[in-house]
Interface confidence: medium
């Protein structure tokens, strides 16, 4: 999972000012794992701020690994964290709400929420459990938050910046609660 | 009784494109998502991609991912695989698969083998 | 490198249980994901052998039963019989950043005779 349309700052030891990332896993190690290849990767480095590269076991690991350089600027650095930040100011729905309805192919019939276009409104459906796309909530209230106009309460900009004092996250989320399922 | 059958492989040089075929029977073919699994000479099984029953959905592996383009015709009830810009790596048998229960593939056809080399 | 690991080899007498193990991750396995295990005889296509962790399809033997929990997940077959032969793989949904349906590297089981 990773968090969408939640932000987390970043304090590092450093004369740069707060590093605000959309993505908390783009903070953790860069993860090995625990077999043997020998496969060129690359994560966020939340010091330098900057995409790099290293050399990944082939299994396990985190999600701050990436295959291309291009995919981890495009997920963990500051151009896109301004993108989506502008949006927001903007009152724009993410891209992603105007996707369909996708339960996925597996057959496991979660309750979730989608926004539907048609409606202008939340509404619940029933989702596989996996692949689907990212117009996809566990909850009303977060659906209606990302998506419909007026944002639920307090909604904008305000909701998503949410401040931690970490140096390196250790592989894991960071201890609140988890927002959006981000499926491909 | 359940049948897929796929068509369409052969030699490809490196670069080229290729289009497969999987022509379903036996089922209702609109009420099932299907899937293109492949495996290496030797090696293991990799799923390739994804398509919903309608047809409004598609899914693909990060490896084929803008070079592969899954779809299907449902009044013909065959699922099809557009294979573009293809390397070596992409050698392989190729699979159509329906999925039935869970996140399982209940049936699979014969396969057919795609070879890419210059 | 698959994401589920299995043993590549097992090898078993007749008559004997053999259990085929499947290891996962946090994002896999342990995310509550159902994994399923198919069986591919040599020269043929695979065939669905266990799914939702441990239903059979019909036609299946009862010999042959799975189980999850956890990160891993694990195919148990008893009364082994020469038939048996074959590579088995597990399978389940990985919900990491590229979400996608995962297969373990398979298992050779050889039937000893």
């Known amino acids: 999972d990773s968090e969408e349309d939640e932000e987390y700052t970043i304090i590092t030891d450093t004369e740069l000012p707060p590093l605000k990332l959309m993505h908390s896993f783009c903070a953790f190690k860069p993860d090995d794992g625990p077999c043997k290849a020998i496969m060129k990767r690359f994560f966020f480095n939340i010091f330098t701020r900057q995409c790099e590269e290293f050399i990944y076991g082939g299994c396990g690991g985190n999600q701050n690994r990436f295959e291309s350089m291009e995919e981890c600027k495009k997920v963990c650095t500051r151009d896109n964290v301004n993108r989506i930040i502008q949006t927001a100011l903007q009152k724009e729905k993410p891209d992603f709400c105007f996707l369909e309805e996708d339960p996925g192919i597996c057959r496991g019939y979660i309750t979730r929420y989608f926004y539907n276009n048609q409606s202008k409104q939340c509404e619940r459906f029933k989702y596989g459990g996996c692949l689907g796309n990212m117009n996809n909530f566990e909850t009303l209230e977060e659906c209606k938050n990302t998506c419909e106009d007026g944002g639920g309460s307090g909604g904008g900009l305000n909701d998503i910046f949410e401040a931690q004092k970490i140096e390196w996250h250790e592989g894991g989320p960071p201890h609140h609660h988890h927002h959006h399922h981000h499926h491909h | 009784e359940v049948q897929l059958v796929e068509s369409g492989g052969g030699l490809v040089q490196p670069g080229g494109s290729l289009r497969l075929s999987c022509a379903a029977s036996?089922?209702?073919?609109?009420?099932?998502?299907m899937s293109w699994v492949r495996q290496a000479p030797g090696k293991g099984l990799e799923w390739v991609s994804a398509?919903?029953?309608?047809?409004?959905?598609?899914y693909y592996a990060d490896s084929v991912k803008g070079r592969f383009t899954i779809s299907r015709d449902n009044s013909k009830n065959t699922l099809y695989l557009q294979m573009n810009s293809l390397r070596a790596e992409d050698t392989a048998v190729y699979y159509c698969?329906?999925?039935?229960?869970?996140?399982?593939?209940?049936?699979w056809g014969q396969g057919t083998l795609v070879t890419v080399s210059s | 490198q698959s994401v589920l690991t299995q043993p590549p080899s097992l090898s078993g007498a007749p008559g004997q249980r053999v259990t085929i193990s499947c290891t996962g991750s946090?994002?896999?396995?342990?995310?509550?994901?159902?994994v399923q295990w198919y069986q591919q005889l040599p020269g043929t296509a695979p065939k669905l052998l266990i799914f939702?962790?441990?239903n059979r399809p019909s036609g299946v033997p009862d010999r042959f039963s799975g189980s999850r929990s956890g990160t891993s997940a694990s195919l148990a077959i008893t009364g082994l019989q020469a038939e048996d032969e074959a590579n088995y793989y597990c399978?389940?949904?990985?919900?990491?950043?590229?979400?996608?349906?995962?297969f373990g590297g398979g298992t050779k089981l050889t039937v000893l005779g």
């Open positions: 398509i919903s029953g309608s047809g409004g959905s598609t």
């Open positions: 036996g089922f209702t073919f609109s009420s099932y998502a």
């Open positions: 946090s994002s896999n396995l342990g995310a509550d994901y159902d």
């Open positions: 698969a329906n999925n039935g229960a869970a996140a399982a593939w209940d049936y």
């Open positions: 399978q389940s949904y990985d919900r990491s950043l590229s979400g996608s349906m995962v």
């Open positions: 939702g962790n441990n």
